[in-house]
Interface confidence: medium
């Protein structure tokens, strides 16, 4: 199926930028792995590079505004021609759910005191209003709550006195049109506007003041332009050469608004001064290699020794990584393929242990399933032997850091009937549904 092809993928927002054009296949668009595509306008943007997980979205708002609730966040597998870690197809969302609490307590309503006395009338003639007030303290609200209804009420009051009405101008009427629209006519163009003393008219009894100033004004029409000439397009110029050596590019034709040139404020030519076409080199673009994550450290050993486990004897271990995805003469991965370090082996060593403090509460699991819970743990943590933290392996090569490696067998006193891990679980509350932000319903 044809797609919309773009020249850039914006990692931070997940949006396609720089529309190259539509009506091309995914395969042609993705000859250049820097490009991106959409299956339909406004749809999900997928980059042409090999798939990987996007950054996690920000946490959604807490599902309740007070007491304990839950909130979700997601990330999306984005890319083309492959899968993300976990053997997941591009377009898939992965979710995380955690507990949240915007405000510990929930608001409680208060109650009103009795009404206070009426204040004096707001005017000294004609009709006005008077007000009385009450306090929200019977009882006072709690935790940001309020009292239902209004803290004050008003009613009409009549002074039994007639007020005078002073005259005021209504707004100016519009300027009358100038007698000519271009300069150079026989008469000097003028424009006039008027207004009425009607907003309001002055009263007769008791007498109000008349409106101050004049009821009309006149002015000369200034800045009238010479009569305008509309612009017209010249012919299209030659098509520019294809600007790329691989993948899809964009060629351009141009024309000039000079047939004739617009004059005296006449309108510029309607339409575009340039038009573009997609050009296809049919050549795949180079793809640089990217390092996979480091592999596991190999066992900690010392040459010519059967085992150095549980002994103050430094050994060596290594780990490797693979340069993946390099195609069509792209750059090789920079840096080392192998990493070597010095180590003490504590693999399967019986070590004295101590119980850790409680860990922080973990994420709610499952994030998109029924009855999610969160957990925290106390672990039996091994006390590491006090071996030298650095060693000098070869004369004159300086000190090297030595790292403990391996899974020891820590021994702690029993805690709640457990020897290695004590776990506490809690249900997550007010859990929202996992909804795809791109496509709620397709």
């Amino acid at each position: 199926d044809p797609v919309l092809c773009f020249t850039q993928y914006e990692e931070s927002s997940g949006k396609c930028k720089g529309l190259l054009g539509g009506g091309v296949s995914v395969e042609d668009c993705c000859l250049n792995t820097a490009f991106a595509y959409q299956k339909r306008s406004g749809g999900l943007c997928q980059p042409c590079r090999s798939p990987r997980w996007s950054l996690w979205s920000t946490w959604a708002p807490c599902s309740v505004t007070c007491s304990e609730g839950s909130q979700l966040r997601y990330r999306r597998c984005v890319g083309w021609n492959g899968q993300c870690s976990g053997k997941v197809a591009p377009g898939t969302l992965e979710w995380q759910l955690q507990a949240c609490e915007d405000q510990q307590c929930c608001p409680e309503m208060g109650g009103w005191s009795g009404w206070g006395p009426w204040e004096p009338c707001s005017v000294t003639c004609s009709k006005g209003t008077r007000t009385r007030r009450r306090a929200c303290n019977h009882p006072a609200p709690k935790c940001g709550g309020h009292c239902p209804g209004q803290a004050q009420e008003s009613e009409a009051c009549d002074t039994q006195q007639v007020c005078p009405t002073h005259g005021a101008w209504a707004t100016w009427g519009p300027w009358t049109p100038c007698s000519a629209s271009c300069h150079g006519g026989p008469h000097e163009p003028k424009e006039t506007r008027s207004r009425k003393c009607s907003a309001p008219e002055p009263s007769q009894k008791p007498p109000g003041k008349p409106c101050p100033g004049l009821a009309y004004e006149q002015r000369r029409c200034t800045g009238l332009p010479p009569c305008p000439v509309a612009g017209g397009w010249g012919p299209w110029g030659p098509v520019s050469p294809c600007p790329v050596t691989c993948g899809l590019g964009q060629t351009m034709e141009q024309r000039t608004c000079n047939h004739p040139v617009p004059q005296h404020g006449g309108p510029f030519c309607a339409g575009d001064a340039t038009r573009t076409h997609i050009c296809n080199t049919a050549v795949p673009c180079p793809v640089d290699g990217e390092w996979d994550s480091w592999g596991e450290w190999s066992p900690c050993i010392r040459r010519n020794m059967k085992s150095i486990s549980c002994q103050e004897i430094p050994g060596q271990q290594s780990r490797g990584r693979t340069c993946r995805g390099r195609k069509f003469d792209g750059h090789r991965c920079a840096g080392q393929q192998q990493d070597i370090r010095h180590c003490y082996s504590i693999q399967h060593c019986p070590l004295k242990g101590s119980w850790s403090e409680w860990s922080t509460w973990g994420l709610c699991m499952p994030p998109c399933g029924p009855n999610p819970t969160r957990a925290r743990q106390r672990l039996c943590t091994p006390l590491l032997p006090k071996y030298p933290p650095t060693v000098s392996m070869v004369e004159g090569q300086g000190e090297k850091n030595v790292t403990f490696w391996g899974r020891p067998l820590p021994r702690c006193e029993e805690l709640q009937g457990q020897k290695l891990v004590v776990e506490e679980k809690r249900p997550c509350l007010h859990v929202p549904a996992c909804k795809d932000p791109e496509e709620e319903e397709l």
Partner: nanobody
């Protein structure tokens, strides 16, 4: 082990309606996402519709959107596919599928057969004048 049993297929005239049912047993139905797929003779299996465990998200293939509706009842451990305005090109064996990931979602996830862990035996739907 989860068992899925489809029913409700049959012969119907163009423009007619059918309601397929998929009854499940042997698992916690409320924690599964459920999907319907179909396979016509000599063609590849294709996605029809899917619903998440709460039924809060529903997804449809373009070819059936507006004509077919997927629904579920967690108390009855059953998912349905209501098919209206049927066309001859809807003729196929219809399969029900269940998926128990509670971590992933999205239209592209539920349209792939590899996503689902359990499948029914299928029910034949024939649309013919």
């Amino acid at each position: 082990q989860v068992q899925l049993v489809e029913s409700g297929g049959g012969l119907v005239q163009p423009g007619g309606s059918l309601r397929l049912s998929c009854a499940t047993s042997g698992g916690t139905f409320s924690s599964y996402a459920m999907g319907w797929f179909r396979q016509a003779p000599g063609k590849e299996r294709e996605f029809v519709a899917a619903t998440t465990w709460q039924g809060s998200n529903r997804y449809y293939a373009e070819s059936v959107a507006g004509r077919f509706t997927i629904s579920r009842d967690n108390a009855k451990s059953t998912v349905w596919l209501q098919m209206n305005s049927l066309k001859p090109e809807d003729t196929a064996v219809y399969y029900c599928a269940a998926e128990h990931s509670t971590r992933y979602s999205g239209f592209y996830y539920y349209t792939r057969g590899e996503t689902y862990h359990y499948w029914g035996q299928g029910t034949q739907v024939t649309v013919s004048g």
